[in-house]
């Protein structure tokens, strides 16, 4: 009976999400493998988040709006491990917008989800950021490593969206 009611709840939750995400990829998690954590297909998952790499070239504001429509934000990178996971799926000759910007050009960087900007957990390339006119951040491959660079927000780039996993 307990299992039946849980399955019914899950199905109704899945139906609820189906209007936003036609397909979900779920894995069993938790102590008793009773919880399911899901990401929209074909998003990838790492820890408690889902990631989507958009190859559409758009400005930073349009990229953020595009993520927002999908219930996500441009990616906020919190750890080196997270960055290493993300970069596995990126092309080395491309650049991707992050959810990091400095709209006033005062070098007051801010994450789109209001996560405090911690200078100690940043992965800027050497010499970056280097221009108050370049108010949006990308991740790209340079000098044999992935790192961040400040760029002009209005110039179209690819982007990475991030959302919390869906638990059912």
């Amino acid at each position: 009976n307990f299992m039946y009611s849980k399955t019914v709840k899950r199905l109704s939750k899945l139906q609820e999400y189906q209007q936003y995400y036609p397909s979900l990829t779920c894995v069993m998690e938790g102590k008793d493998m009773e919880d399911w954590s899901c990401c929209p297909t074909p998003w990838t998952s790492f820890q408690s988040s889902c990631y989507f790499i958009s190859t559409v070239m758009q400005s930073w504001t349009k990229s953020q709006n595009n993520c927002s429509v999908m219930g996500a934000d441009l990616v906020v990178i919190n750890t080196k491990e997270e960055q290493d996971f993300i970069t596995q799926n990126l092309k080395i000759n491309s650049a991707y917008f992050l959810g990091l910007s400095d709209p006033k050009g005062w070098r007051h960087w801010q994450w789109v989800d209001q996560t405090p900007y911690n200078k100690n957990v940043t992965f800027w390339h050497s010499g970056e950021p280097n221009s108050p006119d370049e108010r949006c951040a990308i991740i790209n491959f340079r000098s044999e490593e992935w790192g961040w660079n400040d760029v002009h927000c209005h110039v179209p780039q690819k982007s990475i969206c991030k959302m919390k996993k869906i638990y059912i």
Epitope: T61, S131, D133, H152, H154, V155, P156
Partner: antibody, heavy 121, light 111 residues
């Protein structure tokens, strides 16, 4: 006083080349992004090229990509536009404009008087 | 590319009256309260001159009779009261994404 003075325009045959110059004064030239904007007779303004302050980025619309090259010499306070493979539709007044960044975009706060380019056989 | 449509194409106004020019963008040029639409005045034989930046900010040295408003896709430039020297073409421009684009212009004539 901010001043932008263009030169180098003239009459050229289709397929020909021309190099426009813009001499800047009255401000720290190396600190600003610069653009070329053109205006064909009786038409709307059209952006042609942009170069960032540090010379690290150049941007062009598809209509001129591969034919026009924007460059700058910060030591000489000068902006240039090399125009190759010119077409009749490139006929216009070419303005040099200074960019001022605002939030996620920018606007053109100072413009030169313009130099006329005529492409005709 | 973002297309900017200005209306009317031309208008004739008596001195002391109000002139209103609108600019409609094919998609939003606003983001979190910042409106990346700008207005320029161009007199015959002269280069464009910046009047208003970011929808409503008056450029230094521009008379207070010029004002701008709007958000999203719809923006307005108002001249009130119009003076004889305001005879010119007026252009809107967006900069939220490349390429920066301009409206087709509105010709303002003083009756």
């Amino acid at each position: 006083e901010v001043q932008l003075v263009e030169s180098g325009g003239g009459l050229v045959k289709p397929g020909g080349s021309l190099r426009l110059s813009c001499a800047a004064s009255g401000f720290t030239f190396s600190s600003y992004g610069m653009s070329w904007v053109r205006q064909a007779p009786g038409k709307r303004l059209e952006w042609v090229a942009t170069i960032s302050s540090g010379d690290s980025y150049t941007y062009y619309p598809d209509s001129v990509k591969g034919r026009f090259t924007i460059s700058r010499d910060n030591a000489k306070n000068s902006l240039y536009l090399q125009m190759n493979s010119l077409r009749a539709e490139d006929t216009a007044v070419y303005y040099c404009a200074r960019q001022l960044y605002y939030s996620y975009g920018y606007y053109f706060d100072y413009w030169g008087q313009g130099t006329t380019v005529t492409v005709s056989s | 590319d973002i297309v900017l449509t200005q209306s009317p194409a031309s208008l004739a106004v008596s001195p002391g009256q109000r002139a209103t020019i609108t600019c409609r963008a094919s998609e939003s040029v606003s983001f979190h309260g910042t409106h990346l639409m700008h207005w320029y005045q161009q007199k015959p034989g002269q280069p464009p001159k910046l009047l208003i930046y970011a929808a409503s900010n008056l450029e230094s040295g521009v008379p207070a009779r010029f004002s701008g408003s709007g958000s999203g896709t719809d923006f307005t430039l108002t001249i009130n009261p119009v003076e004889a020297e305001d005879t010119a073409n007026y252009y809107c421009q967006q900069s939220i994404e490349d390429p920066p684009t301009f409206g087709g212009g509105t010709k303002v004539e003083i009756k």
